[in-house]
Interface confidence: low
């Protein structure tokens, strides 16, 4: 007769580190004491005639557990295979690159480490929740790859990678092991550099907005913009309208930059710059400043007048010009009663990169003069009828200006002077019409001959 | 760690020409602007002039124009500042310094590299 | 040139006293952008300069608060310190940024009493 000898349990599943309790049984009536063979760690629990129950601990590794016994001195023996099953230890997505151009292919990579038995775990690649690719667990430590195109919408989108052991067979159900979620930043460069907006001059001390636009940018708000004069940094405000990026700062020449410049704006987006430049030139105009030896003058005296301005201006004054550019312009006169109120014009130009600007200037010369009477507006005889309306055309002039009264010989009747008045006979005689000012005084004789008119 | 590390001390002959460099990191090169400064007994600091290594634009104290050359090498990040005709005037520590546009002050400073010109 | 005239020349002082320091222009180092690029830098013996406040009032990072105050405006500006330790012995120097060329005051040693 053939006895057996069973092992139970048949084929157990477990997890790595787990402990299994083993029984050997025999139906040999004489058989001996029950033996186990295997590498794992065991203890004999309990033992009977026929039977012997252990506890295998620590199970690390898929074994194979052998159970003999001499049964009327021959061996019969028993196996039982034992499955282990380990969830990774580790699934790591790898880090995507820091920006991604969009119509480009990259690459999802993603390693794990551990995990059995192979023939069970499968890797997931995803895209949110949408699975990219799907493929076995391979080599240790088994790495999954993937080609994606990238696009606008996966700007922002979590990529992430997901194991599955699957021990569903085996009665015990997936388990689902899921990476740190990587986040994608997808852009569009265009290939155009910016359009520059910027002043082709620029004088010392003044200031003239620059405007910097890059048209199919993708995503705008994310792009830097750095926009310079020279070397100095210009404060940009930037604004974002859907695609388009506009940098506006203000430009302000200092005058250690004077001389040839560039504005320098440089946009950049996913570690690509593109960069438009334009050649400025930071000018200094000074002037003109026209001075006058005296702004208020005595007849008589000599008074110089000089224009000037900054280096490389041409001036010209009164239609003279300077010996050079950078040199002054000057002239001299003799001040006379007819230069008092005088101005003389200066005009400046600079030639900037073959461009000519123009700045003028003025002032006016004050001459101090004695009082006169124009004898040609102050008739020194008059005849007037009585009871007439009429103006004593009398004008005086002078610096400072005079004051005129006509006054009657031998009284101190004063007639009115440039305004109309009744005329009569008390009117008639000889008249002193006198101009003072601070500069003396000038008299002038006017007779009034007065017709009575005729009685009826 | 941002870090300006200048070469070593240097003897030198009246006359003779002398390099010294700058070597950036921590930060992008071309993001600042490098300066140099001279420091000796009699005359304390004094501002040599800046460079721009992005676009290798200078600047000049009118008083070392002709004595100091500055140049920028961006692929090591490496500033360097050559001294012509030296006589013994020039002995000092020199540094290299950079600012941000903002601040505008020298944030950082090299250790600084003593000249020695004597006969 | 913008001259930068530093008073006092040397500063003795003890542990923990407050110390002032004086820092004056030939001209304005008022910009016509209306910033005013007047910085403070301290030199250790040994060592390079450092720098310690930008722009009149503005500390640099990681300097200690008791570098409080810088102040001033135009031509006039001061340094204080609150409380001084042993680190902070060395060379005191005003520099402005204003005018081309850049220029520096002559130091203000602070010393140990």
């Known amino acids: 007769q053939e006895f057996l000898l069973r092992v139970e349990p048949q084929n157990p599943v477990l997890s790595a580190g787990g402990s299994l309790f083993v029984n050997c049984s025999t139906d040999c009536p004489s058989s001996e004491k029950i033996a186990l063979e295997t590498s794992l760690s065991k203890e004999l629990v309990a033992s009977g005639m026929g039977w012997a129950a252990f506890n295998l601990s620590n199970v690390t590794g898929n074994s194979r557990i052998l159970c003999s016994v001499y049964c009327n001195g021959s061996q019969i023996t028993g196996s039982s295979n034992i499955t282990v099953y380990r969830l990774p230890e580790r699934v790591e997505l790898a880090p995507l690159p820091p920006w991604q151009p969009v119509g480009q292919n990259f690459t999802l990579r993603c390693q794990v480490e551990d995990g059995s038995p192979r023939t069970s775990l499968t890797v997931v690649l995803l895209r949110w929740e949408e699975e990219l690719s799907r493929q076995p667990a391979v080599e240790e430590p088994a790495e999954v790859t993937a080609t994606v195109l990238a696009s606008r919408d996966d700007h922002g989108a979590p990529f992430s990678c997901r194991t599955e052991l699957d021990m569903q067979p085996q009665g015990l159900g997936l388990f689902v092991n899921t990476s740190a979620p990587r986040q994608l930043r997808t852009f569009v460069l265009p290939v155009t550099p910016p359009r520059l907006v910027a002043p082709r001059f620029l004088e010392v001390e003044t200031s003239w907005p620059v405007d910097c636009t890059l048209d199919g940018l993708f995503p705008a708000s994310e792009a830097q913009v750095y926009l310079a004069l020279g070397d100095q940094m210009l404060n940009a405000t930037v604004m974002n309208h859907g695609d388009t990026l506009t940098a506006t700062a203000t430009a302000t020449a200092r005058a250690d930059q004077e001389g040839a410049r560039e504005i320098v704006c440089n946009v950049t987006l996913g570690g690509e710059r593109r960069e438009a430049r334009e050649n400025l030139t930071v000018f200094s105009f000074l002037g003109p400043i026209v001075n006058l030896s005296e702004p208020t003058a005595h007849e008589g005296s000599t008074v110089t007048v000089s224009c000037m301005a900054g280096a490389r201006v041409q001036v010209t004054l009164d239609g003279v010009p300077a010996a050079a550019p950078g040199q002054p312009a000057q002239l001299q006169l003799n001040a006379t009663e007819s230069d008092d109120g005088r101005s003389f014009f200066c005009s400046a130009t600079l030639e900037v990169d073959g461009e000519f600007l123009h700045r003028n200037s003025s002032v006016q010369l004050r001459v101090l003069y004695g009082p006169k009477i124009d004898r040609a507006t102050c008739p020194q005889h008059l005849k007037w009828k009585d009871k007439t309306r009429h103006v004593l055309q009398c004008q005086a002039r002078g610096n400072p200006y005079p004051e005129l009264r006509c006054l009657k010989e031998g009284s101190s009747r004063e007639v009115p002077v440039g305004i109309p008045f009744f005329v009569n006979v008390t009117h008639n005689g000889t008249y002193q019409c006198q101009a003072s000012s601070s500069r003396g005084k000038y008299t002038l004789v006017v007779v009034m001959d007065i017709e009575a008119g005729s009685s009826h | 760690e941002i870090q300006l590390q200048q070469t070593g001390p240097e003897l030198v002959k009246p006359g003779a020409s002398v390099k010294i460099s700058c070597k950036a990191s921590?930060?992008?090169?071309?993001?600042?602007?490098i300066l140099w400064v001279k420091q000796s007994h009699g005359k304390g600091l004094e501002w040599i002039g800046k460079?721009?290594?992005?676009?290798?634009?200078?600047t000049y104290n009118l008083k070392f124009k002709g004595k100091a050359t500055l140049t920028v090498d961006k692929s090591s990040s490496t500033a360097h500042m050559q001294l012509n005709s030296l006589t013994s005037e020039d002995s000092a520590v020199y540094y290299c310094?950079?600012?941000?546009?903002?601040?505008?002050?020298?944030?950082?400073w090299g250790q600084g590299t003593s000249v020695t010109v004597s006969s | 040139d913008a001259v930068m005239t530093q008073t006092p020349l040397s500063l003795p002082v003890s542990l923990g006293d407050q110390a002032s320091i004086s820092c004056r222009s030939s001209?304005?180092?008022?910009?016509?952008?209306?910033?005013?690029?007047l910085h403070w830098y301290l030199q250790k013996p040994g060592q390079s300069p450092q720098l310690l406040i930008y722009?009149?009032?503005?500390r640099f990072s990681g300097v200690p608060d008791r570098f409080g105050s810088g102040s001033g405006s135009g031509t006039d500006f001061t340094l204080k310190l609150s409380r001084v330790e042993a680190e902070d012995l060395g060379v005191y120097f005003c520099?402005?940024?204003?005018?081309?060329?850049?220029?520096f005051g002559g130091g203000t040693k602070l010393e140990i009493k």
């Open positions: 921590g930060y992008s090169f071309t993001d600042c602007i």
């Open positions: 520099s402005q940024s204003t005018h081309v060329p850049y220029t």
């Open positions: 722009k009149v009032s503005n």
């Open positions: 001209q304005s180092l008022v910009h016509s952008n209306g910033d005013t690029y």
């Open positions: 460079i721009n290594p992005y676009f290798g634009t200078t």
């Open positions: 310094a950079r600012k941000e546009a903002y601040p505008d002050a020298m944030d950082y």
